[in-house]
């Protein structure tokens, strides 16, 4: 039975040009994390795995950095990179949980004066 | 060169016992995920058991669960499938096949052994 | 457990032609997907892993997409030897499920 649970950052915002850090945490459970993939809209952008440490899709080598942890930074962001992004974690014996996090990339002007939220 | 050769397959009765054997070669076995996939008469592949790199972690489908073992013995690059209370569904060709890192899925098959559960 | 529904279940179709395979799955499954090809007699082999990676060996006019829940592999310019059968195979949760599998065979 899966009792677990994800906590990420829920809603967060971040300038243009800036950098992100997107944080998930699995609790509740024993299970083993044997993988973490990110993965935004229909991409995977990064895996992280027990054994065999961070792969970063090609496509995502130059804007994306491992960790910290679990976690994933993006860089140089665009206001392109807005959207909802995903952390998959492949676990046993309870098998498959994911969280969500949006990000809203402002221009920034509009983020020094904008209100900044986060969701625990 | 990957290599994977099963071996073992046989006609046994419902409710018999029956363990097949893969040898890899050409790659290093301690290093990948391994799995046991079954075709059925009518070409339906079905996955059968899982085992990660270290043989610490198992998974396997309802149909089979509490009847199938996966194992390995990475000193002899050999993986194992003990299957025990057959049955006439259990009849196929059962392949072992290597998990590319990373991604679960399966990169290199071995050739099949078949398997024929029948009074 | 998640449920795989390919289509079609065949197709006849002739050299030269663009041919379009496609997997539904009963719930998000990310990019946790892999395309196979098996020809008669033979072994499967992987195609397409991670949804969109053509894997290595595969020739390029194979390519695997995703919108949501649906993921396609497409066959652009049919050879005679791509003729045989394609599945798709989840990886998600505990249970690593295939789908139907389509048989394309020439016209």
């Known amino acids: 039975m899966m009792t677990g649970t994800i906590e990420t950052t829920g809603n967060i915002s971040a300038e243009k040009g800036g950098s992100i850090i997107l944080q998930c945490h699995l609790s509740s459970t024993t299970a083993q994390v044997t993988q973490v993939n990110w993965e935004q809209q229909d991409q995977l952008l990064a895996i992280c795995n027990a054994d065999l440490g961070w792969h970063i899709s090609p496509s995502f080598k130059d804007r994306v950095a491992p960790g910290p942890g679990l976690g994933l930074t993006l860089q140089s962001l665009t206001v392109n990179d807005t959207g909802e992004y995903f952390c998959i974690y492949h676990t046993y014996p309870d098998g498959t949980y994911t969280g969500r996090i949006f990000l809203e990339v402002l221009e920034s002007s509009v983020a020094e004066h904008g209100a900044r939220f986060q969701i625990p | 060169e990957v290599q994977l050769v099963e071996s073992g397959g046989d006609l046994v009765k419902p409710g018999g016992s029956l363990k097949l054997s893969c040898a890899a070669s050409?790659?290093?076995?301690?290093?990948?995920?391994m799995s046991w996939v079954r075709q059925t008469p009518d070409k339906r592949l079905e996955w059968v058991a899982i085992?990660?790199?270290?043989?610490?972690?198992?998974y396997y489908p309802d149909s089979v669960k509490g009847r199938f073992t996966i194992s390995r013995d990475n000193a002899k690059n050999t993986l194992y499938l003990q299957m025990s209370s057959l049955k006439s569904e259990d009849t196929a060709m059962y392949y072992c096949?290597?998990?590319?890192?990373?991604?679960?899925?399966?990169?290199?098959w071995g050739q099949g052994t078949s398997v024929t559960v029948s009074s | 457990d998640i449920q795989m529904t390919q289509s079609p279940a065949s197709l006849s179709v002739s050299v030269g032609e663009t041919v379009t395979i496609t997997c539904r799955a009963s719930?998000?499954?990310?990019?946790?997907l892999a395309w196979y090809q098996q020809k008669q007699g033979k072994s499967p082999q992987l195609l397409v892993y991670?949804?969109?990676n053509l894997a290595d060996g595969a020739p390029s006019r194979f390519s695997g997409s995703r919108s949501g829940t649906q993921y396609s592999l497409k066959i652009n310019s049919l050879q005679s030897e791509d003729f045989g059968s394609y599945y798709c195979?989840?990886?998600?949760?505990?249970?690593?499920?295939f789908g139907g599998g389509t048989k394309l065979e020439i016209k």
């Open positions: 096949a290597r998990q590319i890192h990373y991604f679960f899925a399966m990169d290199y």
């Open positions: 050409g790659f290093t076995f301690s290093s990948y995920g």
């Open positions: 085992i990660s790199s270290g043989g610490n972690y198992t």
């Open positions: 719930e998000n499954i990310y990019s946790n």
């Open positions: 991670a949804a969109t």
């Open positions: 195979q989840h990886f998600w949760g505990t249970a690593y499920t």
